[in-house]
Interface confidence: low
């Protein structure tokens, strides 16, 4: 009993392709790349159909439908175009994944084009199936530090060129002390800033000192020290980690990690600092923010930021040896001779950074952590020195230029 | 999301009490607790509050007179040793999300459950 | 402690007009203030917090301002539903809670 003749589907075929079928002949359909059979509102690689002995087939023949890999996974931080008319999401479709510019990038400068493959997946050529990812850009202001006077005592800091600048504020909206934003949802501050005074005649650092995650907030985008606006982030605390090697008498590795418990917006008054790339030449000019107390013990109204050079290491030795003090190797000062511009209290763990000029971005050098009263002569500021602990910020953050 | 509070009754005075506050709809380990009271005719009266890692504190009057504690669903207030000052409507109420910020304000309440001391 | 003292009890306005309740704290508070509303037998509903954000769901015939230790809540265009007593409340968290969470007296609101 012969069956009548079968018609391939558009973009499919059948095999064997005969001129005539019989009893108990059978066919497989299948499709061309990039399409896929349907049978009943089911998809298929290949469909079976069988001549039987009444000479008629015992399927209708399918259809080949094209693949579809569906709407695209979103990416954080990131956006989607689609190089194809009517947002198409079918089989060679094209699209592109791009980061928020001029606040995120797209790690190691992927090209962001995904095809729609055979099998129904975004593809990228390098990462395959695997989204890209958007980092932050650190280091690069909106706004630009207008030149430098070299004003005794410091000035008001211009709003907006220090976006990676934190407080740390009690939960009653007092400050107690500053630090900086790296990568998406990190704090580095100063170790002293996280644990209470300790007792001159038991100085053992327990962690009943400690400042728990729940006792103190970080803002972002703040600028002035009191006054709300509505640039500003307060964002909780997850977690926070003291250097292992951090020495509560001698301040020695004075820096500590907080992890925040949300991701900030990254904006013009919000973006993370760069991490330094190699050590601090001395004589280099540096920039010194916060909201700490200026000269006759008053407290500013707005971020204040100082421009002073880096001292030299021993140089800055000599001047604490008869304190009894000592700068170690993960400490670094800077500072004038003749005093007058140093960081205070209250601006303890906030940053002090430089611009690299060829590249225009601007990196961390230290946090700032101690020093003989403040502005005295030949008294220099002391600050932790990031470069020193480079490895046990980025082991424990992740965090990358 | 709700919260609902339980066990006000009448007790006589220096018998404990346990009020209980369950919530639903949302999860206490990320959220922080407060509890608040209102005697009757008079304003609202400040507890004490559980983080949502379970840190707790109290109001300094409150330090001794009651405990907070909580499971996965519920959140409880004990009052130590009732005296008649303490019939009041107690209310559970939930803090601000503690990512942002951890501020103790209410933005959700339940009804409240009234706690009569008398002898 | 803090201590927070509010407008005396009972103010009185009629329907569209407006409202202006005080609320002065003992010391600085950084305008960690939130403001309440709450009718006979119901729960207290959040309005306001950080002195002047409108909780969400609240109309914006509602503010807050102030910053100190003054702080104000306005109501505008009054309904008859605003009757109500509306409390202050200064909040804090950690270790500044023990003595930073108070409530104000409250204010009773009566409409003409």
């Known amino acids: 009993n012969e069956c009548p003749e079968l018609q391939p589907p558009v973009h499919g075929k059948i095999e064997p392709s005969q001129a005539k079928y019989f009893f108990k002949d059978q066919v497989l359909v299948s499709c061309d790349t990039g399409y896929k059979v349907l049978k009943d509102n089911v998809e298929m690689d290949t469909f079976q159909i069988e001549c039987l002995k009444d000479g008629t087939w015992s399927n209708k023949i399918p259809t080949c439908k094209i693949v579809d890999c569906r709407a695209p996974g979103e990416l954080e931080h990131g956006l989607i175009t689609f190089s194809t008319r009517n947002n198409l999401t079918t089989y060679k479709s094209e699209i592109k994944y791009s980061c928020q510019e001029p606040y995120y990038k797209m790690l190691n400068n992927n090209t962001g084009i995904y095809t729609c493959s055979a099998q129904g997946v975004w593809m990228n050529k390098v990462l395959g199936r695997s989204l890209p990812t958007c980092l932050p850009v650190c280091g690069l202001p909106k706004f630009s530090r207008k030149l430098m006077a070299r004003i005794f005592n410091g000035r008001p800091a211009q709003k907006g060129t220090t976006p990676w600048i934190a407080m740390l504020s009690h939960l009653n909206g007092q400050p107690f002390c500053g630090g900086s934003l790296l990568g998406s949802s990190w704090i580095v501050t100063a170790a002293h800033c996280l644990h209470q005074s300790l007792d001159p005649e038991d100085p053992t650092l327990r962690d009943s000192d400690l400042l728990s995650p729940s006792d103190f907030k970080i803002i972002l985008g703040k600028h002035w020290r009191l006054r709300s606006d509505e640039n500003e982030q307060h964002l909780g605390v997850k977690h926070t980690t003291l250097h292992p090697q951090y020495d509560p008498n001698t301040f020695e590795n004075d820096v500590a990690l907080v992890e925040l418990l949300e991701s900030p917006v990254l904006n013009a008054f919000v973006m993370p600092i760069c991490l330094p790339e190699g050590p601090q030449q001395e004589g280099a000019m540096v920039i010194v923010s916060g909201w700490g107390k200026q000269f006759l013990q008053r407290f500013p109204e707005t971020l204040m930021e100082i421009e002073i050079p880096i001292v030299d290491h021993s140089t800055c030795q000599k001047a604490y040896a008869p304190l009894k003090k000592k700068v170690t190797r993960d400490m670094i000062c800077a500072g004038e001779k003749e005093g007058g511009k140093d960081a205070c209290a209250g601006d303890a763990g906030g940053p002090m950074v430089t611009l690299n000029r060829e590249r225009g971005q601007w990196y961390l050098v230290g946090t700032v952590s101690w020093g003989d009263d403040c502005g005295k002569k030949d008294r220099y500021g002391v600050y932790s020195y990031i470069h020193h602990n480079k490895d046990w910020i980025q082991r424990v953050t992740g965090v990358r230029n | 999301q709700s919260v609902e509070e339980s066990g006000g009754r009448l007790v006589t005075p220096g018998t404990p009490l346990t009020l209980t506050c369950t919530v639903s709809?949302?999860?206490?380990?990320?959220?922080?607790m407060g509890w608040v009271r209102q005697a009757p005719g008079e304003g609202l009266e400040y507890i004490g509050i559980?983080?949502?890692?379970?840190d707790i504190y109290y109001a300094t009057w409150a330090k001794g007179r009651f405990t907070i504690s909580k499971t996965s669903t519920t959140v409880d207030l004990k009052i130590t040793s009732p005296t008649t000052e303490d019939t009041a409507t107690y209310f559970c109420?939930?803090?601000?999300?503690?990512?942002?910020?951890?501020?103790?304000?209410?933005?959700?309440w339940g009804l409240g459950t009234l706690v009569t001391v008398s002898s | 402690a803090v201590v927070l003292t509010q407008t005396a009890s009972p103010v009185s306005a009629a329907v569209g007009g407006t409202v202006t309740i005080n609320c002065q704290a003992s010391?600085?508070?950084?305008?960690?203030l939130a403001w309440y509303q709450q009718k006979p037998g119901q729960r207290p509903k959040l309005l306001i917090y950080?002195?002047?954000n409108l909780a969400s769901g609240v109309p914006s015939r509602f503010s807050g301002s102030g910053s100190g230790t003054e702080y104000t809540l306005t109501i505008s265009d009054l309904e008859c539903a605003d009757a109500a007593t509306y409390y202050c409340?200064?909040?804090?968290?950690?270790?500044?809670?023990?003595?930073?969470?108070?409530f104000g007296g409250g204010t009773k609101v009566e409409i003409k």
């Open positions: 109420a939930r803090a601000r999300h503690v990512g942002s910020a951890a501020d103790s304000y209410f933005h959700l």
């Open positions: 409340q200064r909040y804090a968290w950690g270790k500044n809670s023990a003595d930073g969470n108070t």
């Open positions: 559980i983080s949502s890692q379970g």
């Open positions: 010391e600085e508070i950084y305008r960690n």
């Open positions: 950080g002195a002047s």
């Open positions: 709809g949302f999860s206490l380990s990320n959220y922080n």
